[in-house]
Interface confidence: low
């Protein structure tokens, strides 16, 4: 099921709302801590500080251990560093469009597409470009709500994420994620 | 550059029906989020209906969720809006803009087409 | 649905003075306000986005800031040019619909 349509409301973990504010909260978190890992100063990124729980807190862990292993991915790194950013917009939606083209969705590519947009905003700080920051977070979050919602509510929220990684096997599901962007990224070169 | 171009209004009986077209080029409609938006004569800015093409994501304003339908054909590059069971109330200048994302508004907007629904 | 509450609803103000528009928020929308102008007949056109971002091409007179749900745009020194409609919209990405102001009529005095 994809996030198509009407969403129920209400302040529960599968609340359309309360997934979109965790989603919020652990991108900015998560491209926070990257940027941070390159060890620039980076005040675009000084979004709404808002304190997380402990749930919320455990799942930042989570995506921070995965960003780790997807540093080291040499040949991702590559790919990634190739990237166009001269259309960023085009380049973001044609990867994110392919990583669920065909309507299969699991917690890696949503970590992903988080990773991807992390590396975009990255580029984005490298190249002085600061107002794609919160544009780039902009897209990777309507990509979100629009196409992924429905599926994480039927996970039961984002705490899904948790159970998904928290096998002994993470890091072979940290290779899949790899693979998942970097066949993704080699579509979007073939057709670019 | 980037151009949208609005058409397909006009008069209309209460109750009638009517299909406004937005042509868009110097972009591509598929990676963006298009919306109507429209204002009632001496009224403010309304936001009417959204189409996300990438993932076939559609929205309404409750005013009009039922009567109206939002869709893109990608190969045309135009953006629709079909109007059914049109009310005296649905009369303004309709506008086909695109959103650029997250905060960052509607950054091109079409010249407005003008539906007036009257008997 | 977040509302947008925007005041003064209309104002009079003479070329050079400076000018606030103030948008509150019924609720939380981060930074995700823009502002637009629009003149009679006409299409509006964006001036700010991401609450304080100027769009390219827009004069460095306009500007605008934010602090928690308030909005302000301001115009340093007005010109003739400047004397049309404006409309604060916010855009927070878990909340649609996107939703407008109900605009602020700037007049020559």
């Known amino acids: 099921m994809d996030g198509s349509g009407e969403q129920p409301r209400g302040g529960g973990p599968t609340s359309s709302e309360q997934i979109m504010k965790t989603g919020a909260l652990l991108l900015q978190g998560f491209i926070q801590d990257r940027a941070g890992r390159m060890g620039g100063e980076a005040p675009e990124l000084a979004l709404d500080p808002v304190p997380q729980d402990a749930s919320t807190k455990k799942l930042s862990e989570c995506l921070k251990r995965i960003g780790d292993e997807l540093d080291s991915n040499m040949e991702l790194q590559r790919m990634i560093a190739a990237v166009d950013t001269d259309s960023p917009r085009e380049v973001f939606f044609r990867v994110a469009a392919d990583m669920f083209s065909d309507g299969n969705f699991n917690w890696g590519r949503v970590v992903a597409l988080f990773y991807f947009a992390s590396k975009l905003v990255l580029k984005a700080l490298c190249t002085k470009v600061p107002e794609l920051i919160r544009t780039i977070m902009g897209w990777t979050l309507d990509f979100l709500r629009e196409r992924l919602l429905g599926w994480i509510q039927d996970q039961g929220g984002w705490d899904g994420l948790l159970s998904y990684f928290g096998t002994p096997t993470w890091q072979t599901v940290t290779i899949f994620v790899a693979g998942v962007l970097t066949a993704s990224l080699t579509i979007w070169k073939k057709m670019g | 550059e980037v151009q949208l171009v609005e058409s397909g209004g006009g008069l209309v009986q209460p109750g009638g029906s009517l299909r406004l077209s937005c042509a868009a080029s110097?972009?591509?409609?598929?990676?963006?989020?298009m919306h109507w938006v429209r204002q009632a004569p001496g009224k403010g800015l309304e936001w009417v209906a959204s189409?996300?093409?990438?993932?076939?994501?559609?929205s309404y304003a409750d005013s009009v969720k039922g009567r109206f339908t939002i869709s893109a054909d990608t190969s045309k590059n135009t953006a629709y809006l079909q109007m059914n069971s049109l009310r005296a109330e649905d009369t303004a200048v309709y506008y086909c803009?695109?959103?650029?994302?997250?905060?960052?508004?509607?950054?091109?907007w079409g010249q407005g087409t003008l539906v007036t629904v009257s008997s | 649905d977040i509302q947008m509450t925007q005041s003064p609803s209309s104002l009079s103000a003479s070329v050079g003075d400076r000018v606030t528009i103030t948008c509150r928020a019924s609720?939380?929308?981060?930074?995700?306000v823009a502002w637009y102008q629009q003149k009679p007949g006409k299409a509006p056109k964006l001036l700010i986005y991401?609450?304080?971002s100027l769009y390219s091409g827009v004069p460095s007179r306009f500007s605008g800031s934010r602090s928690g749900t308030d909005f302000t745009l301001t115009i340093s020194s007005l010109q003739p040019e400047d004397f049309a409609t404006y409309y604060c919209?916010?855009?927070?990405?878990?909340?649609?619909?996107?939703?407008f102001g109900q605009g602020t009529k700037v007049e020559i005095k």
């Open positions: 991401s609450a304080s």
């Open positions: 110097g972009f591509n409609l598929s990676y963006s989020s």
């Open positions: 609720q939380s929308v981060s930074s995700a």
């Open positions: 803009a695109r959103y650029y994302g997250y905060g960052g508004g509607i950054d091109y």
């Open positions: 919209q916010q855009s927070w990405y878990y909340s649609y619909p996107i939703t």
């Open positions: 189409i996300s093409s990438y993932y076939s994501y559609t």
